[in-house]
Amino acid sequence: QNCSGPCRCPDEPAPRCPAGVSLVLDGCGCCRVCAKQLGELCTERDPCDPHKGLFCDFGSPANRKIGVCTAKDGAPCIFGGTVYRSGESFQSSCKYQCTCLDGAVGCMPLCSMDVRLPSPDCPFPRRVKLPGKCCEEWVCDEPKDQTVVGPALAAYRLEDTFGPDPTMIRANCLVQTTEWSACSKTCGMGISTRVTNDNASCRLEKQSRLCMVRPCEADLEENIKKGKKCIRTPKISKPIKFELSGCTSMKTYRAKFCGVCTDGRCCTPHRTTTLPVEFKCPDGEVMKKNMMFIKTCACHYNCPGDNDIFESLYYRKMYGDMA
């Protein structure tokens, strides 16, 4: 969007912004908009919150179309009510080792965070907090009703989880990469971020990728088969093109998405990979963005809860990126 044309704003009055979000002029100095926050997608017309020291990081100069709101170098982090300096590592609880980098916090789990799917010897796995122990452990609940019959067990399988190896050492560098954060949107296009020092200079850097856990328009519950409670990875009938702020992916993708459950469980990406996607914009500009592609999803009771900041922080993460 170039700023050379006359300013004209939407017909409705200036928006009401949520608490803590600044009402600012767009990047052209034309219209009042709610500032984008840390980790959100931004454009020239949708600027980041300047009062929080954020700027729109477009990545390479060739991609000056859509960026991610990023804190200026050295910006501190506020986490759990405590301020941490950029570069500072801290143990947020007995379960997580975290690092602050330019306003973003990346955390590594100190406990095993595998997703355990039902299996013949443990058809109803559940994580429980044991007295005197920090990390939760898996226990096997007895089934509430004995309706599980032999052939049905074929549907159960254990899934591998692939995570970064936190003890990888390379040329005097202890390579550490946090898990990808949860997608910022439960449906539609969002952003997922992580912190890593897996680079030539062993410097901590933030990485971001686009993500789509499921399309917003899909009514997935309709596809749940009779007698079932979940649809873990619904089949997408036709290849789709991704849309990003008016730009469209140049290729079509037969992407996998995560489904839904009707029994209180949530379905989240289990194994993912990161691939570049090229988007073509109406003005002909082409930009390349990294995007999460789902390999498998898992449906589980470890849904994000507001009662525990760390639980919700981690369980909304993407498991096992393979790229």
């Epitope: 004209r8 200036a14 034309c30």
Partner: antibody, heavy 119, light 111 residues
Framework: EVQLVESGGGLVQPGGSLRLSCAAS????????MAWVRQAPGKGLEWVAN????????DLLASLKSRFTISRDNAKNSVYLQMNSLRAEDTAVYYC????????????WGAGTTVTVSS | VVMTQTPLSLSVSLGDQASISCKSS???????????LEWYLQKPGQSPQLLIY???SRASGVPDRFSGSGSGTDFTLKISRVEAEDLGVYYC?????????FGQGTKLEIK
């Protein structure tokens, strides 16, 4: 009542300067763009300049950019047009207008102030 | 963008319909896909007043005998039943591209 009142016009010699003022009342001034439109004697309307809510963006007729400046003071509910190096062809009635910045442009106009550039 | 109005003057009997045409030298669709074509009336000795915005939307307090239509480069203002208070000069205006420009004006007289 919504009102715009211009002042500062008058007779000035070629090469001289004038500063026009427009005092606004009856509405939340900082919620609107403001503009200046002029009308030479016996001629049609000509857009001169407009300014955004807080004065951080101004747009002017290209041929006037080097000589004219639009500014505003939200604390005083006023918009200004600084005119330098005036020429005979700048002789006109200068209207201050409210610009909604949304659906329509000039929904409220002042009565105008006359600027005459002559030796 | 040059805005060309026709006719330049118009003499109409009270109660008759009046029609004024405005042609732009290029499409006046703004980059946000709206068309900012407006009509203003300047009554004798007065400041201009807004009649129509975005091609066909009537401004607050404007009687429904005024209507606007058109698209692309061709636009029309119609006054269905001319009244004595309608006399004056009518200007079309485009706000989609810089410089913002007015037509040269159409003078409406009462027969």
């Amino acid at each position: 009542e919504v009102q715009l009142v211009e002042s500062g016009g008058g007779l000035v010699q070629p090469g001289g300067s004038l500063r026009l003022s427009c005092a606004a009342s009856g509405f939340t001034f900082s919620d609107y763009y403001m503009a200046w439109v002029r009308q030479a004697p016996g001629k049609g309307l000509e857009w001169v300049a407009n300014i955004n809510y807080e004065g951080s963006r101004t747009d002017l007729l290209a041929s006037l950019k080097s000589r004219f400046t639009i500014s505003r003071d939200n604390a005083k509910n006023s918009v200004y047009l600084q005119m330098n190096s005036l020429r005979a062809e700048d002789t006109a009635v200068y209207y201050c207008a409210r610009d909604t910045s949304r659906g329509s442009y000039f929904d409220v106009w002042g009565a105008g102030t006359t600027v005459t550039v002559s030796s | 963008v040059v805005m060309t109005q026709t006719p330049l003057s118009l003499s109409v009997s009270l109660g008759d319909q009046a029609s004024i045409s405005c042609k732009s030298s290029q499409s006046i669709v703004h980059y946000n896909e709206n068309t900012y074509l407006e009509w203003y009336l300047q009554k004798p000795g007065q400041s201009p007043q807004l009649l129509i915005y975005k091609v066909s939307s009537r401004a607050s307090g404007v009687p429904d005998r005024f209507s606007g239509s058109g698209s692309g480069t061709d636009f029309t203002l119609k006054i269905s039943r001319v009244e004595a208070e309608d006399l004056g000069v009518y200007y079309c205006f485009q706000g989609s591209h810089f410089p913002l420009t007015f037509g040269q004006g159409t003078k409406l007289e009462i027969k």
